[in-house]
């Protein structure tokens, strides 16, 4: 059960420090549905910077390195929680906000009701 | 600039309501790197339920529907913010925590220094 307003310590505890092996992932480039990462910045939000994935192609990369339009590159999306200053510009008052972000892309077999 | 402790309204504002088009994604099943979703529950955390993706195969599904081990299914991970009750069981005091979650899987070409 959660009350409406709570106190939150912004001194972040990182539970990922023991991730092993550590790697700066290059999946965005090596995927059959590669993507680029775009910086989304909003000073009224915490975290203020979020990276959004945008699939590079409409189709997927085949074994020959060409785009195959019989398959579809699609974004994998996740709803995440962020803090939004409320009222705007408030130094220490926030509201939880749910936003949808694209994290990366995957290659899927087309659905029957394909747009094309 | 953010102070150390802030007030947060937990009445979530959902910015995704005007997403057009809306969809309940079945990519986990249609992907060439399909995944299963596992429920991770923790009453000391907000949100208390998080879904974790686990890739079904080491390889990727080819056009014949078989697993091709010349390609690798890999998880796409994202760091997200959650609220952790601090001290434990506290009704209205939390600390921000960063956790790594697997959102889905993508199919990648193997790296040169392959484990095999």
């Amino acid at each position: 059960n959660f009350p409406r307003t709570v106190m939150v310590n912004l001194n972040i505890h990182n539970r990922n420090t023991n991730t092993n092996p550590k790697r700066s992932s290059d999946y965005y480039d090596r995927s059959t549905s590669p993507w680029n990462l775009h910086r989304n910045e909003d000073p009224e939000r915490y975290p203020s910077v979020i990276w959004e994935a945008k699939c590079r192609h409409l189709g997927c990369i085949n074994a020959d390195g060409n785009v195959d339009y019989h398959m579809n590159s699609v974004p994998i999306q996740q709803e995440i929680l962020v803090l939004r200053r409320e009222p705007p510009h408030s130094p220490n008052s926030f509201r939880l906000e749910k936003i949808l972000v694209s994290v990366g892309c995957t290659c899927v077999t087309p659905i029957v009701h394909h747009v094309a | 600039n953010f102070p150390r402790t802030v007030m947060v309204n937990l009445n979530i504002h959902n910015r995704n309501t005007n997403t057009n088009p809306k969809r309940s994604s079945d990519y986990y099943d249609r992907s060439t790197s399909p995944w299963n979703l596992h429920r991770n529950e923790d009453p000391e955390r907000y949100p208390s339920v998080i879904w974790e993706a686990k890739c079904r195969h080491l390889g990727c599904i080819n056009a014949d529907g078989n697993v091709d081990y010349h390609m690798n299914s890999v998880p796409i991970q994202q760091e997200i913010l959650v609220l952790r009750r601090e001290p434990p069981h506290s009704p209205n005091s939390f600390r921000l925590e960063k956790i790594l979650v697997s959102v889905g899987c993508t199919c990648v070409t193997p790296i040169v220094h392959h484990v095999a």
């Epitope: 945008k54 699939c55 | 088009p21």
Partner: nanobody, 123 residues
Framework: QVQLVESGGGLVQPGGSLRLSCAVS????????MGWFRRPPGKEREFVAA????????KYADFVTDRFTISRDDAKSTVYLQMNSLKPEDTAVYYC????????????????WGQGTQVTVSS
């Protein structure tokens, strides 16, 4: 709220050309993909063309056969459809829309469309 404003339609003779424009506001324009669709008289809305966020990848419906070209200008938040060698069967109301799932986007999922722009090909 999102706004999609299509323009550039009109009456044109067979073999003629038109350039359609679609101005997008109320959302981040540079989404994954944008598309053009059309609704011929008495028929269902159908896919015409799609373009990826970078503008580097395009896909066309089979009936297009090298006659149409889709392009986008992120600075102007506008997507275009250059239509050449128009035929009477291209007569339709043309619409643009965001394609957040690329070619995987289904038309029955959309909740809103712009007002469209009428293209009539007739002698």
């Amino acid at each position: 709220q999102v706004q999609l404003v299509e323009s550039g339609g009109g009456l044109v003779q067979p073999g003629g050309s038109l350039r359609l424009s679609c101005a997008v506001s109320g959302r981040t324009f540079s989404s994954y993909a944008m598309g053009w669709f059309r609704r011929p008289p008495g028929k269902e809305r159908e896919f015409v063309a799609a373009i990826s966020w970078s503008g580097g990848d395009t896909k066309y419906a089979d009936f297009v056969t090298d006659r149409f070209t889709i392009s986008r200008d992120d600075a102007k938040s506008t997507v275009y459809l250059q239509m050449n060698s128009l035929k009477p069967e291209d007569t339709a109301v043309y619409y643009c829309n965001d394609m957040p799932y690329g070619l995987d986007t289904r038309m029955d999922e959309y909740e809103y469309w712009g007002q469209g722009t009428q293209v009539t090909v007739s002698s």
